[in-house]
Amino acid sequence: APTSSSTKKTQLQLEHLLLDLQMILNGINNYKNPKLTRMLTFKFYMPKKATELKHLQCLEEELKPLEEVLNLAQSKNFHLRPRDLISNINVIVLELKGSETTFMCEYADETATIVEFLNRWITFCQSIISTLT
């Protein structure tokens, strides 16, 4: 059974994942982002079901394509580069989903834009956090 400290750690990790996904989304939605139109042409796979931590496998499998799209936001001044954000998200996802069980991700038939994709995983984090608090 999960202990109070392990639940607290899971919650903190989910909060960090949520914050970085929101940060990426905010950067994409920024009115000063000239690459937004191009970014929206890329399609992402959405999970058929995302209700448990093991479903983060579906997010993990889309992190490389996500980084490639974020690289379009070429800036003279990156405070954080796309690879910094994706690397941190990857570490959190691996810790949250665990490596004991191998879960085969099932994807929905419809693909999504980067904005829809990020919003889906933001909602996922918020939903899981709400069950822990």
């Epitope: 970085d20 950067g27 800036s75 954080l80 910094d84 954000l85 998200i89």
Partner: nanobody, 119 residues
Framework: EVQLVESGGGLVQPGGSLRLSCAAS????????MGWYRQAPGKQRELVAA???????NYADSVKGRFTISRDNAKNTVYLQMNSLKPEDTAVYYC?????????????WGQGTQVTVSS
């Protein structure tokens, strides 16, 4: 409006350590990047390290393995632990607050704190 107050600078011998702190107050958003930039005399301001509210980090190559950036979201404070300091680390260190990860402009800058590495 965001106010940034830095502390922890000073004079240190080569090989020594310092810990810089920067507390942000005012209109803080929960989603942000805070970091440290530095400017040596006659040189351009350069990134030292940055960290997102979610914990993503970026370090300048010249400080990797020596400096560690961390933050306390509850206190809106960012820290820079500087170890194995070298004379070339001498500069004014500025705290930065940004609402985006890729912006070409930084939203707010601190006043700066002097770090001098000399024997």
């Amino acid at each position: 409006e965001v106010q940034l107050v830095e502390s922890g600078g000073g004079l240190v011998q080569p090989g020594g350590s310092l810990r810089l702190s920067c507390a942000a107050s005012g209109s803080i958003f929960s989603i942000n990047v805070m970091g440290w930039y530095r400017q040596a005399p006659g040189k351009q301001r350069e990134l030292v390290a940055a960290i997102s509210s979610g914990g993503s980090t970026n370090y300048a190559d010249s400080v990797k393995g020596r400096f560690t950036i961390s933050r306390d979201n509850a206190k809106n404070t960012v820290y820079l632990q500087m170890n194995s300091l070298k004379p070339e680390d001498t500069a004014v260190y500025y705290c930065a607050y940004a609402s985006s990860w890729y912006e070409d402009e930084t939203d707010y800058w601190g006043q700066g704190t002097q770090v001098t590495v000399s024997s």
